[in-house]
C-alpha cells in the first residue's frame, strides 16, 4: 500500500470556535441555494477503495480543487463568511503542501476526478454545492488528517 508522508494537521486547526462556526455558517448559507439534494460530492463514493491512511492525501486534493476552482472564482459571494473562511482553508492547504503518497495514486485521482467532473457538469450550481459541502470538507479533513 502507498505510504503517506507529512499528511498530518494539528488538532488545534479544528478547535478554533470562531472560524469553525464561520465555516459551517458559509456551508449552510450556500446549501440553502443548492436545490440538487440528490447529488453528494463528499461521501462514500469519494472514499470508495481508498484506505484510511490515504484519506488525508485524497482530501488534500479535494481541498486544493475546492480552493482553486470553486472558492477563488466565487469569492465575492456569501459574504462576510467567504472572506474569513477562504484564508483559513488556504492555510490548511499550505500545511498539507508536503503531503504525498509513495506509489500509485491512480485510484485516488480517479475518485477526485469524478468529483471534479460532477462539479464541472453542474456548472455554477456545482460550485454552489461544493461550497454547501464545506462542512463535510471540514469534517473529512479533520477525520483524515489529525
Amino acid at each position: 500500500a502507498p505510504i503517506s508522508s507529512h499528511c498530518r494537521l494539528d488538532k488545534s486547526n479544528f478547535q478554533q470556535p470562531y472560524i469553525t462556526n464561520r465555516t459551517f455558517m458559509l456551508a449552510k448559507e450556500a446549501s440553502l441555494a443548492d436545490n440538487n439534494t440528490d447529488v453528494r460530492l463528499i461521501g462514500e463514493k469519494l472514499f470508495h477503495g481508498v484506505s484510511m491512511s490515504e484519506r488525508c492525501y485524497l482530501m488534500k486534493q479535494v481541498l486544493n480543487f475546492t480552493l482553486e476552482e470553486v472558492l477563488f472564482p466565487q469569492s465575492d459571494r456569501f459574504q462576510p463568511y467567504m472572506q474569513e473562511v477562504v484564508p483559513f482553508l488556504a492555510r490548511l492547504s499550505n500545511r498539507l503542501s508536503t503531503c504525498h503518497i509513495e506509489g500509485d495514486d491512480l485510484h485516488i485521482q480517479r475518485n477526485v476526478q469524478k468529483l471534479k467532473d460532477t462539479v464541472k457538469k453542474l456548472g455554477e450550481s456545482g460550485e454552489i454545492k461544493a461550497i454547501g459541502e464545506l462542512d463535510l470538507l471540514f469534517m473529512s479533513l479533520r477525520n483524515a488528517c489529525i
Partner: antibody, heavy 119, light 107 residues
Framework: QVQLVESGAEVKKPGASVKVSCKAS????????ISWVRQAPGQGLEWMGW????????NYAQKFQGRVTMTTDTSTSTAYMELRSLRSDDTAVYYC????????????WGQGTLVTVSS | DIQMTQSPSTLSASIGDRVTITCRAS??????LAWYQQKPGKAPKLLIY???SLASGAPSRFSGSGFGTDFTLTISSLQPDDFATYYC?????????FGGGTKLEIK
C-alpha cells in the same frame, strides 16, 4: 414518490432468526444507503446499523455485532436485515430508513415491521 | 461512542404555547444533529437536520438551534397536530445515536 416498503409482521421463537425486507422506489437506490432502527414496545429509537447500497459496505452498532447481517439486492432495490439468535427482548418494530451514511439524516422511513419473539 | 441526552422526558403544554426541547451530546458534534417527530404506531418523521435546517414538508413553526454539544428544538406556537414524541439524533460518520425522546402531552 420516494418510499420504503417493509415486509409484514413476523412471530418467531427464541433462538430463531428473522429476515426483514425493505423495498425502495422513487429514487436511485445506489445513491443512498439504508439504516435499520428498532423500537421496543413503549421504548425509544435504537440504531442498529447501516449498509451502503452502492458498495455493500456495512457498519453495525456494537450491540448487534455478530448477530445482525445487512444486505442489499440492487436488481430489485431491496435492503434486508437478518437478526439471529432471537431473544424476547428483540420484540420490537424494525424500521428501515434512507441514509447516505456520511453525516446524513434519515429523511425517508419505512412503515415498520413488528417482530414478536415468544415461546 | 457519543451519547445523546434529551430533556425533559415528558412535557405538558397547551395549544398556542411556545415549547422548547433540549438535547446534549457527550462530546462536540458541530452541527450534525437531527430532530424527528413520532406519533403512536407511525414511523418517525424528519423535522430538522444539521441542527437548524428545516426538512422538506416540515411546518415552519418548528426551528432548531445549537452548535457543539447543546441543541434545542422550538415549536413557536403549539398546534393540535404537534402532540407527539420528539427525538434528537446525532448524524455521524456511518454511525448514529438517538436521544431518549421527549413526550409532548396536552396540559
Amino acid at each position: 414518490q420516494v418510499q420504503l416498503v417493509e415486509s409484514g409482521a413476523e412471530v418467531k421463537k427464541p433462538g430463531a432468526s428473522v429476515k426483514v425486507s425493505c423495498k425502495a422506489s422513487g429514487y436511485t437506490f445506489t445513491s443512498y444507503g439504508i439504516s435499520w432502527v428498532r423500537q421496543a414496545p413503549g421504548q425509544g429509537l435504537e440504531w442498529m446499523g447501516w449498509i451502503s447500497a452502492y458498495t455493500g459496505n456495512t457498519n453495525y452498532a456494537q450491540k448487534f455485532q455478530g448477530r445482525v447481517t445487512m444486505t442489499t439486492d440492487t436488481s430489485t432495490s431491496t435492503a434486508y436485515m437478518e437478526l439471529r439468535s432471537l431473544r424476547s427482548d428483540d420484540t420490537a418494530v424494525y424500521y428501515c430508513a434512507r441514509d447516505r451514511g456520511y453525516y446524513d439524516a434519515f429523511d425517508i422511513w419505512g412503515q415498520g415491521t413488528l417482530v414478536t419473539v415468544s415461546s | 461512542d457519543i451519547q445523546m441526552t434529551q430533556s425533559p422526558s415528558t412535557l405538558s403544554a397547551s395549544i398556542g404555547d411556545r415549547v422548547t426541547i433540549t438535547c446534549r451530546a457527550s462530546e462536540g458534534i458541530y452541527h450534525w444533529l437531527a430532530w424527528y417527530q413520532q406519533k403512536p404506531g407511525k414511523a418517525p418523521k424528519l423535522l430538522i437536520y444539521k441542527a437548524s435546517s428545516l426538512a422538506s414538508g416540515a411546518p415552519s413553526r418548528f426551528s432548531g438551534s445549537g452548535f457543539g454539544t447543546d441543541f434545542t428544538l422550538t415549536i413557536s406556537s403549539l398546534q393540535p397536530d404537534d402532540f407527539a414524541t420528539y427525538y434528537c439524533q446525532q448524524m455521524g460518520e456511518w454511525k448514529a445515536a438517538f436521544g431518549g425522546g421527549t413526550k409532548l402531552e396536552i396540559k
